[in-house]
Each structure stands twice: as C-alpha cells, then as structure tokens.
Interface confidence: medium
C-alpha cells in the first residue's frame, strides 16, 4: 500500500523515497526520479546532477531534492497535486540500468477553512425570528456538516441548515455557508448563537453571536 502523506495548500509536501542505501552507493552512480500517476516526471537526479529536460512543465521550479533523506519536496502545493507519486531509483552499470528501489506515496492536500462567521441578514422582527447566514471560506476537502447552535438560559437547540457550497475553478477550494431563519424558543431570555463547521478531522466554532432581549414589562398590579 502507498505511504499516505498529508500536506497543506500553498505549502510543501515531502515525498519520501525511504531508500536505506545499505550498499552505501554514491548518487553519482544512481538515477533517482519521481513520477505522478500520469507518468509525468517531477524531478530527476541523474548520476548526482539534477536533470530538467525530462521534468514536466507543471512541476518545473516547484521541487527540491534532499539527498540526505532521499526526499523530494514539492512546493506551492495545489489541490490538483493530490494523488499518487512514485519514487524510482536505478543503479547505472556498464550493462545498463538496474532498478534497485521504488516507493509509492499517496498525497492528500488539505486547506483549513476559515473560522465560521455569523452575519445577521435581518433584524429581529415582531414575529420573533431572525435571518442569519453563517459562512466559512477557502477550505478543502468539502466539510461534512454545518450547523447553528442556539443557546438560552435553559435550553440548547441545534439547527441543521442546507449547506450551500461553491468551488473555485482555479484553486479548487470550497466556500460554504448556511442560511437560517431562527425563531426564539424563549422570548424572555437572552441567547447566544454559535455556528459549527465539521470536517473529517476538526470542528470549527464561530465567535459567539449574542442577542440581548429586553425583559417585557410586568403587568400592573390588579386593584380590586
């Protein structure tokens, strides 16, 4: 099974070769290269020197080889870089090339969503409800769930809205939002609203959005 690697959008991924080099072979007698699953070459170190004529344009200038750890660093990661990579090492002998090592890696590229933000899109009406939008941007992969938590003095209610999502054609990052019309269960108490975004690995919470409700005036004393 390929080695699973996770790295973040616009950052750097380390694609290891995990070559033990038990024979203590010099780079000057080896050919080391990485290819993706479309057979496009990311990097080639030919007998100790980096060779660029075989490198595909989408990887040009985005890689660096660490000869100490036999690791290729892929910089400025894009979502489209996710997938399978293979490191292959050949030993160049007078009789030809002998493959002595190979390793597959499976790269996942992540992007952290921004902290969810609650924006009211209407004032509290006489019907005692408020329209809210909660949004979070620039994340990957798409989240599992987005919800709103309504907390009063003596109850907590969770609203699951329909998550709207859009994906940027270039970066492939997602923006997500939900819109809710929240009716207040207890008119006499103040309340705090939170928005929650759940991904496979994290749970992001918005800053609290507080609604202060004025206490209604008590009825006048009844005089017989």
């Amino acid at each position: 099974a390929p080695l699973k690697i996770q790295a973040y959008f616009n950052e750097t991924a380390d694609l290891p070769c995990q070559f033990a080099n038990s024979q203590n072979q010099s780079l000057s007698e080896l050919v080391v290269f990485w290819q993706d699953q479309e057979n496009l070459v990311l990097n080639e170190v030919y007998l100790g020197k980096e060779k660029f004529d075989s490198v595909h344009s989408k990887y040009m200038g985005r890689t660096s080889f660490d000869s100490d750890s036999w690791t290729l660093r892929l910089h400025n990661l894009q979502i489209k870089d996710k997938g399978l990579y293979q490191c292959i090492i050949h030993h160049k002998k007078p009789t030809g090339m002998i493959r002595i090592h190979q390793m597959n890696s499976e790269l996942s590229v992540l992007a952290n969503f921004s902290q969810p933000e609650i924006v009211p899109i209407s004032n509290i009406t006489e019907n005692v409800y408020i329209n809210l939008t909660c949004s979070s941007i620039h994340g990957y992969p798409e989240p599992k769930k987005m919800s709103v938590l309504l907390r009063t003095k003596n109850s907590t209610i969770e609203y699951d809205g329909v998550m709207q999502k859009s994906q940027d054609n270039v970066t492939e990052l997602y923006d997500v939002s939900i819109s809710l019309s929240v009716s207040f269960p207890d008119v006499t108490s103040n309340m705090t609203i939170f928005c929650i975004l759940e991904t496979d690995k994290t749970r992001l919470l918005s800053s609290p959005f507080s609604i202060e409700l004025e206490d209604p005036q008590p009825p006048p004393d009844h005089i017989p």
Partner: antibody, heavy 116, light 112 residues
C-alpha cells in the same frame, strides 16, 4: 481492503442499452483511474477505455467509441459504463479495474447477454 | 496502435517443470524518460478475474510467489515460471500501458 464491486448480470434485447456499475471501497476513489475491459470467448481481453476520476477525463479504444460511455459519481465512489445499441457481439463479461500505472485490482465482472 | 503478440497460445507441462512464455510488441515499450518498460503480466484462473503478477516488465506484485519472473526490454518480454504448480493452471496475458492499453491474446497453461 481494496474492493471493486460490480453490478449483477444483465439480459437485454438487441438494440437496447445497458448501464453497469463498479463501486470502489477501501481506498481514495478519486486518486485512481478506472479501466473497463471486455472479455468475450472470441477476443480474450479487450481494453475499452479509462476514466481518470480526479481530472474527469476519458480515453476510449477507437473500437468502442460510440458504443461505450464511461461516467463516474464521485459522491458514491461509483464508476459506470453504458453500452448502447447492443448486438450479440456485445455479449461478454465486462470488468472494471483500478489503475494508476497498472491495473492492480479488478472487479468480479458483470455478464451481459444480448438475446431476443 | 500497439499490437502485442503472445506465444505459444497454449502449452501443457507437468508440475515442477519450468515454463517460459513470450510477449512481443509492435513497438518499444521503454519510456526513455523514466527508463521503465510499460508492460505488465496478468494471470486469469478459470472463472476468476485477472490478477496482476508483474509490472514494469520485471517487478513482482506483492504476494506473488517468487517462482514467477518477468524479464525483457523494448519489444521482447518473457514470463517465466521456474517450477510450475497445479494452481498455476490459468491463462496469462501481457498488457502495455505505454500508449493507452492493449492486451495480448493470452497463453493458456495446462497441467499434464
């Protein structure tokens, strides 16, 4: 573990179409391509085409252009192949296979019989 | 299109014997950039799906017994079974992935 589960056998009439499915599990579905292969008694194994799921592009064997259409539903990790205007020549077992640089896992096959 | 020719189309051997089968390509399968031969060998037992044995012409898939060996480069490739076992009864196919995909016609191995 990696599995490709194909839909069950199909008995169809000449001129009709059939759509067979291949559901992947146990791996990141979008990281691999899905190949489709035909096996008939007359022609052993024939490559139909490949769909690269992540990039959403397809390549067909010239012979199967217009006959086969490959699609994918990423949300259910399922690849589909539709065969159109069926004739007795299309009676065969159809396999899907996972592929990166080679086809390392295969489905169990879907038998398609074309008969009036 | 790349054409793969397999020979023989069938052969029968006794358990313990050595077997070689050939796959010839109409053009070189050696990728000059990656220096790999884009040829794989598959085994298909009766009533089963094909199973990957060898890829890059000579790399054994994990779990495949070491009696199976792939060799060759360019246009001529060979699959060798050093000591045939009863469970090796199958059809063996070569396939190229140098330019899309093509299968050879297969070699049927029978056990005497």
């Amino acid at each position: 573990q990696v599995q490709l589960q194909q839909s069950g056998p199909e008995l169809v009439r000449p001129g009709e179409s059939v759509k067979i499915s291949c559901k992947g599990s146990g791996y990141t579905f979008t990281d691999y391509a899905i190949q489709w292969v035909k096996q008939s008694h007359a022609k052993s194994l024939e490559w139909i085409g490949v769909i690269n799921i992540y990039y959403d592009n397809t390549n067909y064997n010239q012979k199967f252009k217009g006959k086969a259409t490959m699609t994918v539903d990423k949300s259910s990790s399922t690849a589909y192949m539709e065969l159109a205007r069926l004739t007795s020549e299309d009676s065969a077992i159809y396999y899907c296979a996972r592929a990166a640089w080679y086809m390392d896992y295969w489905g169990q096959g879907t038998s398609v019989t074309v008969s009036s | 299109d790349i054409v793969l020719s397999q020979s023989p189309s069938s052969l029968a051997v006794s358990a313990g014997e050595k077997v070689t089968m050939s796959c010839k390509s109409s053009q070189s399968l050696l990728n000059s950039r990656t220096r790999e031969n884009y040829l794989a060998w598959y085994q298909q037992k009766p009533g089963q799906s094909p199973k990957l044995l060898i890829y890059w012409a000579s790399t054994r898939e994990s779990g495949v017994p070491d009696r199976f060996t792939g060799s060759g480069s360019g246009t001529d490739f060979t699959l060798t079974i050093s000591s045939v076992q009863a469970e090796d009864l199958a059809v063996y196919y070569c396939t190229q992935s140098y330019n899309l995909y093509t299968f050879g016609g297969g070699t049927k191995l029978e056990i005497k």
